[in-house]
């Protein structure tokens, strides 16, 4: 297993619709053809997997049908979008990249993107 640098923004504020997008960029030492991207969430020292996708270079990322993540790839960059976020989902979202094929296997873990999520203010009741 060889180490690889992964860069991602430090802080992102999700949209009022609970959508956050950020780029995860990895310094590929070779010509990988198969890449696996995993998003981990760290909150209160607990780490959980949010979503993961394996893709062939040049193809779209395919997450599971019920995943809250979508993404596109371009060269050594992966543009990740996480949707359906609520204020309780605020936390550090860490991008993990694995170059699966061809060997050697490379692993890179970013420092994480702190995603802040603000629940929209409830609309005031209106009488008609």
């Amino acid at each position: 297993c060889k180490a690889m640098h992964v860069a991602q923004p430090a802080v992102v504020l999700a949209s009022s619709r609970g959508i956050a997008s950020f780029v995860c960029e990895y310094a590929s030492p070779g010509k990988a053809t198969e890449v696996r991207v995993t998003v981990l969430r760290q909150a209160d020292s607990q780490v959980t997997e949010v979503c993961a996708a394996t893709y062939m270079m040049g193809n779209e990322l395919t997450f599971l049908d019920d995943s809250i993540c979508t993404g596109t790839s371009s060269g050594n960059q992966v543009n990740l979008t996480i949707q359906g976020l609520r204020a309780m989902d605020t936390g550090l979202y860490i991008c993990k990249v694995e170059l699966m094929y061809p060997p050697p296997y490379y692993l890179g873990i970013g420092n994480g993107t702190q995603i802040y999520v603000i629940d929209p203010e409830p609309c005031p009741d209106s009488d008609f």
Epitope: P9, A10, V11, L13, F22, D44, A87, Q114, Y116, I118
Partner: antibody, heavy 117, light 108 residues
């Protein structure tokens, strides 16, 4: 080193608007946010809101909603805070600060905005 | 809105003494999202502690933070002349982000 430099002091009349700038250097501007905090004379710190320089999304303190606008210019690594319909109780030192994962650091030197007729 | 109440309002101590500053939240705050700042007259605030207990870069080890839930503490083990200032706690746990009203540490 990481630095935030703010624009100079302003004197405004009630009802006018003010726009304070905050120029960042020494780090990747779009990787962080910029928050604005104000301090009335002899008082404590009041959080006004913040902007994510990565995507331009904003979160404002409810009491200022509708009067404040925070923006960034990523080509010049500068953040702006505009406050409209100024009142005498808006007289304060206005600070910008870089927003990290769970901290404000560093802070700008502050901009005194005086609202007086 | 989470209200942060700092106590005491003023702490009168001599150099070399230990200072204990309290910050109490009206609702539970994740310790990841609690910070402390120091402000001297005519200056901008300076980050001391983030994540309730992590010292910011360049902050001397006489400053320490602790606590969880609704009760947080900033401790200055031995006051130096340059430590006499106002100290603020701040929470990032829920919007709006809020500051405590401050504790002034003055020379006795």
């Amino acid at each position: 080193q990481v630095q935030l430099v703010q624009s100079g002091a302003e004197v405004k009349k009630p009802g006018a608007s003010v726009k304070v700038s905050c120029k960042a250097s020494g780090y990747t501007f779009t990787s962080y946010g910029i928050s604005w905090v104000r301090q009335a004379p002899g008082q404590g710190l009041e959080w006004m809101g913040w902007i994510s320089a990565y995507n331009g999304n904003t979160n404002y303190a409810q009491k200022l909603q509708g009067r404040v606008t925070m923006t960034t210019d990523t080509s010049t690594n500068t953040a702006y805070m505009e406050l409209r319909s100024l009142r005498s109780d808006d007289t304060a030192v206005y600070y910008c600060a870089r927003v990290g994962a769970n901290w404000f650091d560093p802070w700008g030197q502050g901009t005194l905005v005086t609202v007086s007729s | 809105e989470i209200v942060l109440t700092q106590s005491p309002g003023t702490l009168s101590l001599s150099p070399g003494e230990r200072a204990t500053l309290s910050c109490r939240a009206s609702q539970s705050v994740s310790s990841s999202y609690l910070a402390w700042y120091q402000q001297k007259p005519g200056q901008a605030p300076r980050l001391l502690i983030y994540g309730a207990s992590s010292r910011a870069t360049g902050i001397p080890d006489r400053f320490s933070g602790s606590g969880s839930g609704t009760d947080f503490t900033l401790t200055i083990s031995r006051l130096e002349p340059e430590d006499f200032a106002v100290y603020y706690c701040q929470q990032f746990g829920s919007s709006p982000w809020t500051f405590g009203q401050g504790t002034k540490v003055e020379i006795k």
